[in-house]
């Protein structure tokens, strides 16, 4: 799976979309999880309604919401009041049994609020060991990153 980068502004909401084949994943609940390290487990943040037929109902866990358009095949996650600590690698998942298929790998980047003059050092950037190949950026203006390109400016 390629990694798609979604950029949001601190303090605002960020909407992440994960398209999928609606027939292939028919009847399956979905989930949004946070990757603990590039090779680590993916920790469940929120999942769609226990009844698949009610997947269109928005479910919240803290400031994160999930809703699933099962007919159109789009899972939507909303991160409300985006904070620097929300930045990182996530996955959209399709659940079957106790297993999960990855629908999309997502890198959330939190940008400074241009109206907020606090120290930009509070914002998150990937460390030297973190690089995401074939990343694709999704925000108001999209661009695809070159292979191997680090999707953030250096911290220094």
């Amino acid at each position: 799976h390629n990694t798609t980068v979604f950029q949001g502004v601190a303090g605002q909401s960020l909407q992440v979309s994960c398209p999928y084949d609606s027939m292939k994943h028919w009847g399956r609940r979905k989930a949004w999880c946070r990757q603990l390290g590039e090779k680590g487990p993916c920790q469940r943040v929120v999942s769609t309604h226990n009844l698949w037929l009610l997947s269109f109902l928005r479910r919240w866990n803290g400031s994160t919401a999930i809703t699933d358009d099962t007919l159109g095949g789009t899972l939507t996650i909303t991160l409300r009041n985006l904070q620097p600590h929300d930045a990182g690698l996530y996955q959209c998942q399709s659940l079957h049994g106790s297993e999960a298929d990855t629908l999309r790998k997502v890198l959330v980047e939190v940008l400074a609020d241009p109206l907020d003059h606090r120290d930009a050092g509070d914002l998150w950037f990937p460390g030297e060991s973190e690089s995401f190949e074939d990343a694709h950026v999704e925000h108001s203006i999209s661009r695809s990153l070159l292979e191997g390109e680090i999707p953030f400016p250096p911290t220094s």
Epitope: K24, W52, H96, G97, E99
Partner: antibody, heavy 123, light 107 residues
Framework: EVQLVQSGAEVKKPGESLKISCKGS????????IAWVRQMPGKGLEWMGT????????RYSPSFQGQVTISADKSISTAYLQWSSLKASDTAMYFC????????????????WGQGTLVTVSS | DIQMTQSPSSVSASVGDRVTITCRAS??????LAWYQQKPGKAPKLLIY???SRQNGVPSRFSGSGSGTDFTLTISSLQPEDFATYFC?????????FGQGTKLEIK
């Protein structure tokens, strides 16, 4: 009426190749996973792997990975199971089965089965 | 892999009897379990899915129960056509695995 019709019985020699088929009808073939299940003579059922004909996404049981190839041609609603070099131990009945997800359960079960293809490998 | 163990491996019973077959998973599988019936020379037939849901067209004398690791298939009043081999199967994780089967014979 949903039907899975498998190709006929085969008698082969060790080392030969073989491709058996499973043709679906009465439903949208591309939209359901198809599994292959082995039953050796007088024995139980073994799940070999599964394929989604819509995009040919395939999963194998570790026991069968590298031993067989599962494929599908959605244009003719047919799934395949093939061997490049048969062994005597491949002698068995092979079933294809449609995998259906039940929406209040979010897992999948084999709701329709083919009639089976008997493969005999003997020198 | 999850191991599925059925008991008994065979059972003799008469028409009208109540029969219970059990299936134990080597680890918890929630309610992701199916029961199949197979007659000689035929393909298996789905009877029960999600541990307790009857497949369309399956007679009400067949019922399933259990969750976690222990499951049962009950036939409340045996009919002549019920003499067959029954398999449980976990749908929790890959690879999918089946029990070794329980052969139901006429006493």
């Amino acid at each position: 009426e949903v039907q899975l019709v498998q190709s006929g019985a085969e008698v082969k020699k060790p080392g030969e190749s073989l491709k058996i088929s499973c043709k679906g009808s009465g439903y949208s073939f591309r939209s359901y996973w198809i599994a292959w299940v082995r039953q050796m003579p007088g024995k139980g059922l073994e799940w070999m792997g599964t394929i989604y004909p819509g995009d040919s996404d395939t999963r194998y049981s570790p026991s069968f990975q590298g031993q067989v190839t599962i494929s599908a041609d959605k244009s003719i609603s047919t799934a395949y199971l093939q061997w490049s070099s048969l062994k005597a131990s491949d002698t068995a009945m092979y079933f294809c089965a449609r995998s259906r997800t039940f929406y209040y359960d979010s897992s999948d079960y084999f709701d329709y089965w083919g009639q089976g293809t008997l493969v005999t490998v003997s020198s | 892999d999850i191991q599925m163990t059925q008991s008994p491996s065979s059972v003799s019973a008469s028409v009208g009897d109540r029969v219970t077959i059990t299936c134990r998973a080597s680890q918890g599988i929630s309610s992701w379990l199916a029961w199949y019936q197979q007659k000689p020379g035929k393909a298996p037939k789905l009877l029960i899915y999600a541990a307790s849901s009857r497949q369309n067209g399956v007679p009400s004398r067949f019922s399933g129960s259990g969750s976690g690791t222990d499951f049962t298939l009950t036939i409340s009043s045996l009919q002549p056509e019920d003499f067959a081999t029954y398999f449980c199967q976990q749908a929790d994780s890959f690879p999918r695995t089946f029990g070794q089967g329980t052969k139901l014979e006429i006493k």
